[in-house]
Interface confidence: medium
């Protein structure tokens, strides 16, 4: 239904707290360099204006679209051109082009320092002094670093943050209470960020139809007892919600997500028997819980999929008459029977089925042609299954750090032209798949591994798009989203690469490395490993292991030495010489 004032409507639906949080996220995601104070001022102005519209929907400007209102606010910021360069050109455009222009200028890798967590005491002091400002800073800092973070979900993480601080700041040992809990939230939020970015990429590159197919597969796995009409309704609504968030329409997105959660909880009987626990929670927790609810028990009496999609004599007629619906029901039926497959795999199978029908239905004897289609799925299913087995075996053997190093070597060989920081970030993220997925029960491993890897590789593609340097990466990133992971897995050593010359300074270290936190130490060592591979792309695993063991021993020795600086300056050059010899 149309409202006289869109901003008043959203303010009323969302309430002041969520309204302000979402406006802050929106501004922080659009203008990523502005300070918290600058954005907080704008948010207050927008909120005050929304209140005047709530009081009188006919008041001046209350009938304007949210894009117009928000865009006008952003364009009124002083020194926009000095701080944001060509983004200021967006302000010469009219809506909807202006908003599209803002979206195109979102930076997936902004040059901002890492978000450092303050000391426990300092954190608790500022949280107690002003919880609202403290949480505002959190929203601002996360949103500007992750310009596609799913806004209603970021509100959920802020709420988690708030609850942890409330609990831990009352404890005697604040540090040991806060650290593991906040680390947990951070890890989950980072995964949420890459997953959502993948959804926005899907929407941006391949449109709503591609996202809806993803949603049908995912929802059918989770709700195998829901009928196709129900799944389609949920997929359509979920597509709308994600389209809005990816498009920067955060108020509409959060409002529609709340509506979807309400609908699901009111229709549990036709959706799933597993929703009640989620539905008992307050809004943000409820929506979050529903998004990762466990799979419902599969119906016991599902007939073989072949009956309707292979053996039926009307397959080609049915397909020709309404292709999307026919393929949609195939995807629904296959997915509800396979919670043990990744969504990417299910979409590849649906694509294979579609290609088979396109080919076979044009032939003289279609049933003879498409009769073997299910058997032809086998290699497509085996490939990711083997990937999971091989990688989980390697993870169990090496542990997370060693597994990350193995992946780093592999990916540096595949795409040595990619910048070392990007390779290290990618390998560290890809390597976490072991900890995240390999400890799960067998039937949950494949969906966990492949869908997580796909999301990480999407980030690799986004970063590479900014400065394309590797033909290998460009090839894999240009294809469809569901083919990316198999494409990257199939890449081998890039034979076109001219090895980097050996620079001693790349492998020169100083005593300051000794005081770094463990994570930073690992990154330094992994940076050196990537550089070694760039120098010797065909070095054997054994050679690299020798060098890295020597390097670790060197760090250990010098960091324990009484005179660290002398140790580094005398032993460092010896290490470099030994490395060169080992790789010769």
């Amino acid at each position: 239904e149309a409202h006289k004032s869109e901003i008043a409507h959203r303010y009323n639906d969302l309430g002041e707290q969520h309204f302000k949080g979402l406006v802050l996220i929106a501004f922080s995601q659009y203008l990523q360099k502005c300070s918290y104070d600058e954005h907080a001022k704008l948010v207050q102005e927008v909120t005050d204006f929304a209140k005047t519209c709530v009081a009188d929907e006919s008041a001046a400007n209350c009938d304007k679209s949210l894009h117009t209102l928000f865009g006008d606010k952003l364009c009124a910021i002083p020194n926009l051109r000095e701080n944001y360069g060509e983004l200021a050109d967006c302000c010469t455009k009219q809506e909807p082009e202006r908003n599209e222009c803002f979206l195109q200028h979102k930076d997936d890798n902004p040059s901002l320092p890492p978000f450092e967590r303050p000391e426990a005491e300092a954190m608790c002091t500022s949280f107690k002094e002003n919880p609202t400002t403290f949480m505002g800073h959190y929203l601002h800092e996360v949103a500007r670093r992750h310009p596609y973070f799913y806004a209603p979900e970021l509100l959920y993480y802020a709420e988690q943050y708030n609850e942890i601080l409330t609990q831990c700041c009352a404890e005697a040992d604040k540090e040991s209470c806060l650290t593991p809990k906040l680390d947990g939230v951070k890890e989950k939020a980072l995964v949420s960020s890459v997953r959502q970015r993948m959804k926005c990429s899907s929407m941006q590159k391949f449109g709503e139809r591609a996202f809806k197919a993803w949603a049908v597969a995912r929802l059918s796995q989770t709700f195998p007892n829901a009928d196709f009409a129900e799944i389609t309704k949920l997929a359509t609504d979920l597509t709308k919600v994600n389209k809005e968030c990816c498009h920067g329409d955060l108020l509409e997105c959060a409002d529609d997500r709340a509506e979807l959660a309400k609908y699901m909880c009111e229709n549990q009987a036709t959706i799933s028997s597993k929703l009640q626990t989620c539905c008992d929670k307050p809004l943000l927790k409820k929506a979050h819980c529903l998004s990762e609810v466990e799979h419902d028990t599969m119906p016991a009496d599902l007939p073989a999929i072949a009956a309707d999609f292979v053996e039926d004599q009307e397959v080609c007629k049915n397909y020709a008459e309404a292709k999307d619906v026919f393929l949609g029901t195939f995807l629904y039926e296959y997915s509800r029977r396979h919670p043990d497959y990744s969504v990417s795999l299910l979409l590849r199978l649906a694509k294979k089925y579609e290609a088979t029908l396109e080919k076979c239905c044009a032939e003289a004897n279609p049933p003879a042609c498409y009769g073997t289609v299910l058997a032809e799925f086998q290699p497509l299913v085996e490939e990711p299954k083997n990937l999971v087995k091989t990688n989980c075996d390697l993870y169990e053997k090496l542990g997370e750090y060693g597994f990350q190093n193995a992946i780093l070597v592999r990916y540096t060989q595949k795409a040595p032209q990619v910048s070392t920081p990007t390779l290290v970030e990618a390998a560290r993220n890809l390597g976490r798949v072991g900890t995240k997925c390999c400890t799960l029960p067998e039937d949950q491993r494949l969906p966990c591994v492949e869908d997580y890897l796909s999301a990480i590789l999407n980030r690799v593609c986004l970063l590479h798009e900014k400065t394309p340097v590797s033909e290998h990466v460009t090839k894999c990133c240009s294809g469809s989203l569901v083919e990316r992971r198999p494409c990257f897995s199939a890449l081998t050593v890039d034979e076109t690469y001219v090895p980097k010359e050996f620079k001693a300074e790349t492998f020169t270290f100083h005593s300051d490395i000794c005081t770094l936190p463990e994570k930073e130490k690992q990154i330094k060592k992994q940076t050196a490993l990537a550089e070694l591979v760039k120098h010797k792309p065909k070095a054997t695993a054994e050679q690299l292991k020798t060098v890295m063991d020597d390097f670790a021993q060197f760090l250990d020795t010098c960091c324990k030495a009484a005179d660290k600086d002398t140790c580094f300056s005398t032993e460092g050059p010896n290490l470099v010489t030994r490395c060169k010899d080992a790789l010769a």
């Epitope: 009928d227 196709f228 009409a229 007629k317 619906v325 949609g328």
Partner: nanobody
Amino acid sequence: QLQVVESGGGLVQAGGSLRLSCAASERTFVAYPMGWFRQAPEKEREFVAGISWFAGATTDYADSVEGRFTISRDNAKNTAYLQMNNLKPEDTAVYYCAISHQLPGGRPGRDMDSYSYWGHGTQVTVSS
């Protein structure tokens, strides 16, 4: 939620014809078998005719209407039809359209339990 609306009922002389329509609110309607049922005063609701998804696919009729009634569907319009010819006084009833929630592509069932989306009905009266 999928909405189903019947229309086309009315009063007709014995031997006459009527065409009932059943409009569904969503495109996904085409992925389901659908059926027509009827309920005469003081009687149980009974199966009349059914059609599986997609035109040209399986149709099924109750013995009492075989040869006189024809069920069809227009997927582009999200609409199904029941063409009723040579009507008899015993065809007088409220006619209901229903959409199945069984396996999409499955055969139309005669059992009321296999249909989950129902319209409110349209009255058909055949006078002698």
